[in-house]
Amino acid sequence: HTAAQDNCTCPTNKMTVCSPDGPGGRCQCRALGSGMAVDCSTLTSKCLLLKARMSAPKNARTLVRPSEHALVDNDGLYDPDCDPEGRFKARQCNQTSVCWCVNSVGVRRTDKGDLSLRCDELVRTHHILIDLRHRPTAGAFNHSDLDAELRRLFRERYRLHPKFVAAVHYEQPTIQIELRQNTSQKAAGDVDIGDAAYYFERDIKGESLFQGRGGLDLRVRGEPLQVERTLIYYLDEIPPKFSMKRLTA
């Protein structure tokens, strides 16, 4: 009888099925929807989380100017195809054979096409800009306190290496968090900025993915930081390919 058998759950992902049937009675967890093995010592990939979400009962959902190539996830939820490592496959298709190419965070980066559409490689999202507006407070937050608290959050809650939090900007009531992570910078075992941003987004919406942990209670010097709007911009290592028709719409 082991500790694993007493508490066979996945601390970092509640969208899992776990059983103490691993080697030596260890707890083994698989993602809902895909059945893929999940490493419960780190964040689960966004692709597996989206797949799990789509399989679950449908009841629960100095400032930087984003570059002209920045993508916003306007398409919402879809049931993605994930590769054996849990990453998004470069080409995604729906049940009606409409296909499109996505980046490493699963956001569409081309016009939609048919089954003949080719997506040669999974293009990496290397820069994520999280744009938040906080609820009115008595006064502005101290910028350096806010910066320190958000960096601590990404380091401790999401296990993102501090070097990938490039900057925190603040002009009341807007907060911007910049995450940067090039392919060459990401070592084995490093949390992906796309996964960290997705966990943060779900936390902010009150839909925490962590097992049994309380929701996100963000405080700066004891003062609650309550977010009323979130926008996330994704910048890829290769600019997206949309037709002019979409760009002028």
Epitope: T2, A4, P23, G24, R26, C27, D39, C40, A188
Partner: nanobody
Framework: QVQLQESGGGLVQPGGSLRLSCAAS????????MSWVRQAPGKGPEWVSY????????YYPDTVKGRFTISRDNSKNTLYLQMNNLRAEDTALYRC??????????????WGQGTMVTVSS
């Protein structure tokens, strides 16, 4: 990148034996825990053996204990699975996997394409 290539599968009669091999590359094999995982048609994957990095510790589920033996040759970057007294229910796709064992949890993070083992008379 991590590459795992299995070989040695095939058709065998009940009671027979097979030895599977897995050639590993793209990561420090001698410091990695490894497992064999199988998936029968229409079923979910299940681990059938585990070995730690230096080969000093192995685990087997009750379904294969006493029949299967996992071993490794770190000088050749190769993992093995000796399967004896095979049964029809051992029919599955067998894949080697890089594994991780903590005090409480077990997970595989990379898998090979697999080699098919069919036990039939």
């Amino acid at each position: 990148q991590v590459q795992l290539q299995e070989s040695g599968g095939g058709l065998v009669q009940p009671g027979g034996s097979l030895r599977l091999s897995c050639a590993a590359s793209g990561f420090p094999f001698s410091s990695a825990d490894m497992s064999w995982v199988r998936q029968a048609p229409g079923k979910g994957p299940e681990w059938v053996s585990y070995i730690n990095a230096d080969g000093s510790k192995t685990y087997y589920p009750d379904t294969v204990k006493g029949r299967f033996t996992i071993s490794r040759d770190n000088s050749k970057n190769t993992l093995y699975l000796q399967m004896n007294n095979l049964r029809a229910e051992d029919t599955a796709l067998y894949r080697c996997a890089r594994a991780k064992l903590t005090d409480t949890h077990y997970v595989e993070d990379y898998w090979g394409q697999g080699t098919m083992v069919t036990v039939s008379s």
